[in-house]
């Protein structure tokens, strides 16, 4: 790291070190030999989240309902607004600027992890012994029916998309 002329939380201007403005405040005027750095608080709809020498505060993010967004956490003078997606939708990126509907898991696949406001549904193929016959964003793979516990026999084998079909035992078998 190259050497710096000033302390932490200071900046160099006109060959002297001035204090940075604290988070939540913007720079009005640099310090002089006789005066401190002058800072002003950000307005209600603005923020600055670091020690800074910015002359303008940043606008809080707008969570646009037309894009499926809603406020998860209201911004302060030191923090930006955090948006999340309405139910049934998730963010398209880490910055959550728009939302898309959750993916449904097709027949033969079950839900491994249910979607959240920030992550999509995670599907997994139904393993042997399990099936899913619906397209769903919630349903996990279900186990095949156990014919034996019902004193029935398998008449039709199950697949990853269908349950087994049970039927009565063949009377002619001893």
């Amino acid at each position: 790291e190259p050497p710096t002329a000033c302390r932490e939380k200071q900046y160099l201007i006109n060959s002297q070190c001035c204090s940075l403005c604290q988070p939540g405040q913007k720079l009005v005027s640099d310090c002089t030999e006789f005066t401190e750095t002058e800072c002003l608080p950000c307005s209600e709809s603005e923020f600055l989240d670091t020690w800074n020498r910015e002359t303008r505060c940043h606008q809080h993010k707008y969570c646009d309902p037309n894009l499926g967004l809603q406020v998860q956490q209201k911004g302060t003078s030191e923090t930006d607004t955090i948006c999340t997606c309405e139910e049934g939708l998730h963010c398209t990126s880490e910055s959550c600027e728009s939302c898309v509907p959750h993916r449904s898991c097709l027949p033969g696949f079950g839900v491994k992890q249910i979607a959240t406001g920030v992550s999509d549904t995670i599907c997994e193929p139904c393993p042997v012994g399990f099936f899913s016959n619906v397209s769903s964003a919630f349903e996990k793979c279900r186990p095949w029916t156990s014919c034996e516990t019902k004193d029935l026999v398998v008449q039709q084998a199950g697949t990853n998309k269908t349950d087994v079909v049970c039927g009565p035992q063949d009377r002619q078998r001893a």
Partner: antibody, heavy 126, light 107 residues
Framework: QVQLVQSGAEVKKPGASVKVSCKAS????????MHWVRQAPGQGLEWMGW????????NYAQKFQGRVTMTRDTSISTAYMELNRLRSDDTAVYYC???????????????????WGQGTLVTVSS | DIQMTQSPSSVSASVGDRVTITCRAS??????LAWYQQKPGKAPNLLIY???TLQSGVPSRFSGSGSGTDFTLTISSLQPEDFATYYC?????????FGGGTKVEIK
């Protein structure tokens, strides 16, 4: 009362490294920058750099960049200065020195040293 | 880097004399200057900071003045314990730099 107690004298060969410690007591260690200053025999004072014990942030004089490392252990209120690739002209007394707490410092870095360690003589000789 | 030039490099004086040491910065440093006293085998001792503020416990015969580039340390009446080397130091920006020192010797 404020005290800075440094480790003992060291004799090193050229190319070796030395690590000097500085144990602080009598004040909040994380509240004041710690600086390192050296003095070659019969010479003046030379500033090496500082460490902010609170954040661990450092700032080294260009001359020592890449050769010096300043660290701290806040659990034992101790600052360390390690100098690598020693040369004969690194023979000097090395001091740790505490920033004077100037509450009204509006500009400037305001680094004045109100407390010093007793000094550690590092001799570099083959 | 800001160069600090002290003069004289040495001065011979007697007890009771008024001694003046000057320090010049290669660029303006406002009032961000300190003066230290160092005795052989000892660490430096802060006398004055912000060019003219006397450090707690330092005798009032020591005074400092100046701003910008030119500064002065004055010992109004030299005492036996004042024979030592004196250094100025700028505290405007890093890297901190010291003057070359002024040795005050017994005449």
């Amino acid at each position: 009362q404020v005290q800075l107690v440094q480790s003992g004298a060291e004799v090193k060969k050229p190319g070796a490294s030395v690590k000097v410690s500085c144990k602080a007591s009598g004040y909040t260690f994380t509240g004041k920058y710690m600086h390192w200053v050296r003095q070659a025999p019969g010479q003046g004072l030379e500033w090496m750099g500082w460490i902010n014990p609170d954040s661990g942030g450092t700032n080294y004089a260009q001359k020592f960049q890449g050769r010096v490392t300043m660290t701290r252990d806040t659990s034992i209120s101790t600052a360390y200065m390690e100098l690598n690739r020693l040369r004969s002209d690194d023979t000097a007394v090395y001091y740790c020195a505490r920033d004077q707490p100037l509450g009204y410092c509006t500009n400037g870095v305001c680094s004045y040293f109100d407390y010093w360690g007793q000094g550690t003589l590092v001799t570099v000789s083959s | 880097d800001i160069q600090m030039t002290q003069s004289p490099s040495s001065v011979s004086a007697s007890v009771g004399d008024r001694v003046t040491i000057t320090c010049r910065a290669s660029q303006g440093i406002y009032s961000w200057l300190a003066w230290y006293q160092q005795k052989p085998g000892k660490a430096p001792n802060l006398l004055i900071y912000t060019a003219s503020t006397l450090q707690s416990g330092v005798p009032s015969r020591f005074s400092g003045s100046g701003s910008g580039t030119d500064f002065t340390l004055t010992i109004s009446s030299l005492q036996p314990e004042d024979f030592a080397t004196y250094y100025c130091q700028q505290a405007n920006i890093f890297p901190l730099t010291f003057g070359g020192g002024t040795k005050v010797e017994i005449k």
